[in-house]
Amino acid sequence: RKIPKVGHTFFQKPESCPPVPGGSMKLDIGIINENQRVSMSRNIESRSTSPWNYTVTWDPNRYPSEVVQAQCRNLGCINAQGKEDISMNSVPIQQETLVVRRKHQGCSVSFQLEKVLVTVGCTCVTPVIHHVQ
Amino acid sequence: RKIPKVGHTFFQKPESCPPVPGGSMKLDIGIINENQRVSMSRNIESRSTSPWNYTVTWDPNRYPSEVVQAQCRNLGCINAQGKEDISMNSVPIQQETLVVRRKHQGCSVSFQLEKVLVTVGCTCVTPVIHHVQ
């Protein structure tokens, strides 16, 4: 799902207030609900009829440093016999997410939000058009 | 996939530098890759064998203000005949994402990161346990 443009209003102070100096804002340390955890059913990536693999990307100047991307294993879907059925399609499910980018020059450290597209998993769909009969 | 704990290091200055004043950091205005957009196959939520609906939650003091949650429509999966097959299970795919929480007292505005669990869609899996024969 998509994140709308900031529209330069969310991060602004009310009009009656002096503007933010130097184009930056105050970001409080700590993360709300930091201990909240994804709870997904076990091994769904291999049990799915549209199975996927995970690839981890790592960047020490990004929070979270680890971003996991899914890739669908098949073009078709896996049928009850464990064979690929190309009359159905495995398709990725994508999500826009925010990460924080760290920028430093000596002791001057600043942060900036960055939008990242993450493929979270795959789902099996009936095709819109049949390339293959 | 899960976001690891901050571990109080990512947002800190190097040890040789003076500490961050008042427990806050500088967040630059603007979002890197703001124009990047999800490109997903059309209507996958209704074409999936594990279809889902979307619910929108709205909070003006959160960025993005709109967070979309998916809910699987069925317990089983939809077969080639368009009927629900309860020998297979529709399960949610979750993702941890970051949002920004805005806090203001008069002209003093600060921001804080918040972790949110988002259900992005659903996938059809072979069951771990057979509740139903």
Epitope: - | T55, Q71, R73, N74, E84, S90, V91, P92
Partner: nanobody, 123 residues
């Protein structure tokens, strides 16, 4: 913490009926299914029935199929279990719970249960 309140249990003769209800205080945004479970004295808790909040489709354990009917009222965050043709072996404490992974949910996935409602079927 989500709260679950089950009610409607009681003592009934074999062949009789009862209608259980369960109110969930707060549905998670992604929560899509609810289940009924039961635990007879000295036995493990077992699955009875499940329903999808959106689709409304219900599934049943073989032992209750054709006798029990699960339904839901989305506006009231309530699910029901209509139990007909009750048998002595249906005697148990009945619990409801959110099923975060639908039919993929296992007993290990729960860390919280309500107080349940006792159903006793006499012969």
């Amino acid at each position: 913490q989500v709260q679950l309140v089950e009610s409607g249990g009681g003592l009934v003769q074999a062949g009789g009926s009862l209608n259980l209800s369960c109110v969930i205080s707060r549905r998670t945004p992604s929560g899509y299914a609810m289940g009924w479970f039961r635990q007879a004295s000295g036995k493990e808790r077992e699955f009875v029935a499940a329903i999808s909040w959106i689709g409304g489709g219900a599934v049943y354990a073989d032992s209750v199929k054709g006798r029990f009917t699960m339904s839901r009222d989305n506006a009231k965050n309530t699910v029901y279990l209509q139990m007909n043709s009750l048998k002595p072996e249906d005697t148990a404490v009945y619990y409801c719970n959110d099923m975060p992974y639908g039919l993929d949910t296992t007993m290990d996935d729960y860390d919280y249960w309500g107080q349940g409602t006792l159903v006793t079927v006499s012969s």
